[in-house]
């Protein structure tokens, strides 16, 4: 809900020669005073004096950190990722104890062949980054490994990664069904036991711009919201112009308070403006003074 203009107002002369009605009550939180040397500064809302000026905390700005910004920087990651924990059973290689040692020549050769095979399997998936073997164990060789996926951050990144994980499942199921041993021989790069293929776990990057926006807005969290422009999220208050949620104050100035965004209406030489959006103009009556 938007606050109405306080009854008690102070008229300030604007740069255009008109006046702006501003609240005479202090809507900010209690004053914090910090002293450096013999310089005393009133830095409000948790701001601190650095010897020259107030250093304000988000979402405040101004000489005394008394004003609320119209937009807050939020920085989604450039890329987002998913990690799939998979198990496959390779039948074309027999297990030896040396495979347990990740620095052995056996492990390095197995890793090379397995990586080549998986790169072929997942070659059509744009989000595919690679595989990482986490453990090898007996049976012929049970391969516990991670499939790594990555994509550029967009608002739909979760859908993109979810789709990619589904394609990974389809492709690994297909290859482990088709590339199987015949008479104890494998004619493919690797052969598999069809029943040994399992997806253990899927972890997807969690990033919520709305959550970051609300956290940074602190006590104004209910009044800041996220809007997208060119797939980039912006954390804005209704006082930020140019967005769908922007508040149109017509003949006035938008200002944030702890009750939300409100319009402070101007008074010109000819009109008073009022209303929630400063769109109701009342013409002043003219009194002529003779000298």
């Amino acid at each position: 809900p938007l606050a109405t203009i306080p009854v008690s107002t102070t008229s300030l002369t604007s740069s255009e020669g008109s006046t702006i009605s501003t609240p005479s009550v202090d809507i900010s939180t209690p004053v914090t005073t910090s002293i450096v040397g013999d310089q005393c500064s009133r830095c409000k809302n948790g701001g601190f004096w650095d010897g020259l000026k107030c250093q304000c905390l988000t979402p405040y700005y101004g000489e005394s950190c008394e004003e609320v910004v119209n937009s807050i920087d939020i920085a989604p990651p450039e890329t987002v990722s998913a990690q799939m924990e998979l198990t496959v059973t390779v039948t074309s290689v027999k297990f030896t104890d040396e495979l347990k040692n990740h620095s052995s020549q056996e492990f390095r050769e197995f890793n090379k062949t397995f990586t080549e095979q998986m790169n072929i399997v997942y070659s059509g998936i744009p989000e595919y980054v690679g595989v990482n073997i986490t453990n090898l164990r007996l049976g012929s060789v049970v391969v516990e490994h991670d499939v790594l996926l990555r994509t550029k951050y967009t608002p739909e990144y979760k859908t993109a990664l979810d789709n990619a994980t589904e394609v990974v499942k389809q492709k690994i199921t297909k290859v482990t069904t088709e590339q199987i041993m015949t008479n104890d021989n494998c004619s493919a790069l690797m052969c598999f036991n069809t029943t040994g293929t399992q997806v253990q776990n899927i972890t997807v990057t969690q990033y919520d711009p709305v959550e970051e926006c609300r956290q940074k807005a602190e006590e104004y969290e209910d009044y800041f919201l996220v809007e997208y422009r060119d797939q980039k999220p912006y954390c804005i208050s209704p006082c930020e112009s140019g967005f769908n949620a922007s508040k149109n104050c017509n003949h006035g100035k938008c200002q944030m308070s702890q009750n939300g965004a409100r319009c402070l209406c101007v008074t010109t030489e000819t009109h008073w403006y009022s209303g929630e959006d400063c769109n109701q103009g009342t013409q002043k009556s003219h009194h002529h003074h003779h000298h």
Epitope: S92, T96, E109, T113, E116, M181, D184, N185, L189
Partner: nanobody
Framework: EVQLVESGGGVVQPGGSLRLSCAAS????????WGWFRQAPGKEREAVAL???????FYADSVKGRFTISRDNSKNTLYLQMNSLRAEDTAVYYC?????????????????WGQGTMVTVSS
């Protein structure tokens, strides 16, 4: 570093015999897998005879009963005894090795290769 050096190739008449050798170094010869592959002009490399440390052996259908793979661990050497040679056996023969105990005929799964020795069967 693993090094494989083949020898024993040459020109032989149909029905004749040859014995190929592959000397290995930088490798524990008693473990892993060893094999002979061949590549005829304009064709893909194919598995001829393979052997693994656990006793597994493979022979291509076209050489069964004519070729024999063996190894001498004390000499770190792999052999291919080729009898009753035919014109279609003409190819470059490659020795291959892996520290893994393999069951695969696919050359891409084999990591170490010799430079090859030419076998020509011609009258």
């Amino acid at each position: 570093e693993v090094q494989l050096v083949e020898s024993g190739g040459g020109v032989v008449q149909p029905g004749g015999s040859l014995r190929l050798s592959c000397a290995a170094s930088g490798f524990t010869f008693s473990r892993g897998s060893w094999g002979w592959f061949r590549q005829a002009p304009g064709k893909e490399r194919e598995a001829v005879a393979l052997i693994s440390s656990d006793g597994w052996t493979f022979y291509a259908d076209s050489v069964k009963g004519r070729f024999t793979i063996s190894r001498d661990n004390s000499k770190n050497t792999l052999y291919l005894q080729m009898n009753s040679l035919r014109a279609e056996d003409t190819a470059v023969y490659y020795c291959a090795a892996s520290v893994l105990v393999l069951r695969t005929l696919n050359p891409k799964a084999w990591h170490h290769w010799g430079q090859g020795t030419m076998v020509t069967v011609s009258s």
